[in-house]
């Protein structure tokens, strides 16, 4: 019988090393030869390489080897296979060979923590004396702490030009040991080297360092009293695993200090019930090894006029980052926090703050937001302890099309003319935001047309139809991301009108 | 930085044989190609064969007639050409030279500084 | 095997001038082809490869041009330190070849 087809191709270039070509040879039942046909040079050459093993494992690989390796290249290879009964040929397998570039681990030889710097150990490496010189590398650095079985990983990349091997590992748990192990790959490249071998480091010991602290004010109550809801969180650059025993609040009057009340919770948010007048809020988090410095906002008193400074304000999409700007009239504002949270009926229980200064942009990764959900954000100005008048829009991460189309209804039918009406979808099928909708209609057996309408309009006029016509109409709500259709709806013209 | 270091001036007898050495070295001596050209006095440029350090897999101009055989020592980072039997026209600057750029096979980047071969009776 | 043939053999010029050397190939070897520099007593230095495809280090006056079997080195501005030897080799395969050199002369 004939030899069974070569199947699952596989070619990986050990860089400067070998070209291996491996595959699945099938169940063989005699001797069975392999020979490896490849063109390369871009196509401008080609050879063949053949199989000399006896051990049939063996035989289901064939390496090619310098000086007739070249990157980048673009290879064809196809395997046949021969024995005594005949010749049968694999499909055609394709491969960029920058690709397919597989290099040795770099080599690891310092992990220390960088003196005055806390949290933070800077890894120091050899990359591998045989990678590509036309190619930057990619690098994925696993890091654990001792006693822990689970790795951690961060990706980056280094460019070919620079000389600078190292990489700062931050938001590490403070006076912990950790391993690390480096791996890489050219940078188009979907082969990784092994990990080098593991190498320990240490971090410095210290306390909590820092809070940021926001607040969501509520509307008085009857009692003139007003719920503020504290949150507070790390600040930034803290260490990811930094541990806090608890923290301690205390809070008084703008106008006397002597009122002061104090608390301590291990929570991360707290409801206070503050009177009418402006009050200070402090608070620190502390450890076994000390306490945070002090976090200290300003509560405005509920008749407090807050300023106003943001003029406009959009959001975009750019490189999987959801991007929203603004512009503000006061020029002494570089300080602005940033509420997000979904747009759901139900009261947010999601909400979400940053705080950005010297900029009038911010940017979250797409990847943080859910998608084809809307989100409302929020921008406050922040000067000194004033907090001014937010500015809020709408936005989506990434869009979708709607997951269903508008409700749609026939009105006002004529001898030549209709009305077609629908509804605005619902927000929690919308998937983005409504840029236009689109109706469509045909004559039974006619060509069909359509007409485009902006996404304030929900209604719209069909004029010039052909009397006692049976019609099929239906319209799409589109975002940015594609339309979806409504149900289609069928109606007839009339055969005359009461004017005529 | 990338070095290849040549053994000395050899003067040969005709029908003898030179073995003239290239020590590489600020490199992995594995993952690059050796070729060896040659150069007679006032001439022009001769290549002569090459080797893959890595699998010792050779190639050789046909010209030399089974006369050159490239070796190379992976525990000393050196490569060998031994050409026989000798005739005065084997007289030339014989010149180790390392392949270079992923993306120009057959092209001699790095060269030694030559080593002067005479066959003179 | 491929034959390469390099004209002229030699030239004259002066600093400032816009030199040309041609390498023509026995057979079609796509862009398979280097330039090299050779002063005298010294190795040569690879100048070009793939036809085009300047080595690291090389001045920009230097430029290869050609596919197929017509190739040109050329210098733009000919420079003090340009006076030497020019060699075409191709690389499209084994056995190597290098064509007859150019001596590229003071005027």
């Known amino acids: 019988a004939l030899p069974a087809k070569p199947e699952n191709i596989s070619c990986v270039y050990y860089y400067r090393k070998n070209l291996t070509c491996t595959w699945s040879p099938g169940k063989e039942t005699s001797y069975t030869q392999y020979t490896v046909k490849r063109t390369y040079a871009f196509g401008e050459k080609h050879d063949n390489c053949t199989t000399n093993s006896s051990t049939s494992e063996n035989r289901a690989s064939c390496s090619f080897f310098l000086p007739r390796i070249t990157i980048p290249d673009n290879y064809t290879i196809e395997v046949e296979a021969e024995n005594g009964d005949g010749v049968i040929k694999s499909h055609m397998t394709y491969w960029r060979l920058e690709n397919i570039a597989k290099t040795e681990p770099p080599k690891i030889f310092r992990v220390k923590p960088v003196l005055g710097i806390k949290r933070m150990i800077q890894i120091e490496w050899i990359k591998p004396e045989l990678a590509p010189v036309s190619s930057d590398l990619k690098y994925t650095l696993r890091f654990r702490t001792v006693n822990s079985t689970s790795w951690m990983e961060v990706n980056f990349a280094k460019n070919r030009k620079d000389k600078n091997q190292t990489y700062n590992l931050t938001g590490l748990q403070p006076f912990t040991e950790y391993v690390i192990a480096l791996r890489c790959a050219v940078k188009e490249s979907k082969f990784w080297s092994d990990w080098s071998q593991e190498k320990m480091g240490m971090t410095e010991e210290e306390a909590p360092c820092g809070l940021e602290l926001w607040r969501v004010l509520k509307p008085a109550e009857a009692d003139g009293r007003r719920p503020v809801r504290l949150l507070w969180k790390k600040a930034r650059g803290a260490p990811v695993l930094e541990k806090t025993l608890g923290y301690n609040i205390w809070y008084y009057p703008e106008s006397n200090t002597n009122l002061t009340e104090t608390m301590n919770t291990t929570n991360q948010q707290l409801e206070l019930h503050l009177g009418g007048e402006s009050f200070w809020v402090s608070m620190i988090s502390y450890n076994s090894l000390g306490k945070s410095p002090v976090a200290t906002l300003r509560i405005p008193a509920i008749q407090e006029k807050s300023f106003q400074c943001i003029e406009v304000m959009q959001a975009c999409v750019a490189e999987d980052q959801l991007v929203v700007k603004w512009q503000s009239s006061a020029l002494d504002v570089n300080t602005w926090m940033i509420e997000w949270f979904p747009d759901v009926d139900s009261e947010p229980t999601t909400l979400s703050w940053e705080s950005v200064s010297q900029a009038t942009n911010w940017t979250i990764q797409q990847d943080k937001l859910k998608p084809f959900w809307c989100y409302n954000i929020s921008v406050y100005p922040m000067l000194h302890d004033k907090v001014g008048e937010p500015y809020s829009i709408q936005a989506y991460a990434k869009e979708g099309v709607p997951s269903e189309g508008p409700e749609t209804k026939v009105e006002n039918i004529g001898v030549k003319t209709v009305t077609i009406t629908w509804k605005e979808i619902p927000k929690s099928e919308r998937k983005g935001i409504i840029c236009n909708y689109t109706i469509f209609y045909q004559a039974e057996g006619g060509k069909g047309f359509s007409k485009t309408v902006n996404s304030s309009i929900l209604q719209y006029g069909l004029e010039s139809l052909k009397r006692k016509t049976s019609y099929i109409v239906q319209v799409m709500a589109s975002t940015s991301a594609g339309g979806t259709n409504g149900t289609s709806i069928n109606f007839k013209t009339l055969s005359f009108s009461v004017f005529e | 930085q990338v070095q290849l270091v040549q053994s000395g001036a050899e003067v040969k007898k005709p029908g003898a044989s030179v073995k003239v050495s290239c020590k590489a070295s600020g490199y992995t001596f594995t993952g690059y190609i050796m070729n060896w050209v040659r150069q007679a006095p006032g001439q022009g440029l001769e290549w002569m064969g090459l080797i893959n350090p890595y699998n010792g897999g050779t190639d050789y101009n046909p010209q030399f007639q089974g006369r050159v055989t490239i070796t190379a020592d992976e525990s000393t980072s050196t490569a060998y050409m031994e050409l026989s039997s000798l005739r005065s026209e084997d007289t030339a600057v014989y010149y180790c030279?390392?392949?270079?750029?992923?993306?120009?096979?057959?092209?001699?980047?790095?060269w030694g500084q030559g080593t002067l071969v005479t066959v003179s009776s | 095997d491929i034959q390469m043939t390099q004209s002229p053999s030699s030239l004259s010029a002066s600093v400032g001038d816009r030199v040309t050397i041609t390498c023509q190939a026995s057979?079609?070897?796509?862009?398979?082809v280097a330039w090299y520099q050779q002063k005298p007593g010294k190795a040569p230095k690879l100048l070009i490869y793939n036809a085009q495809t300047e080595a690291q280090g090389v001045p920009s006056r230097f430029s290869g041009s050609g596919s197929g079997t017509d190739f040109t080195l050329t210098i733009s501005s000919l420079q003090p330190e340009d006076f030497a030897t020019y060699y075409c080799q191709h690389h499209y395969d084994s056995p190597l070849t290098f064509g007859g050199g150019t001596k590229v002369e003071i005027k």
């Open positions: 030279a390392r392949d270079g750029y992923d993306d120009g096979p057959y092209t001699l980047e790095t």
């Open positions: 057979e079609d070897i796509y862009s398979f």
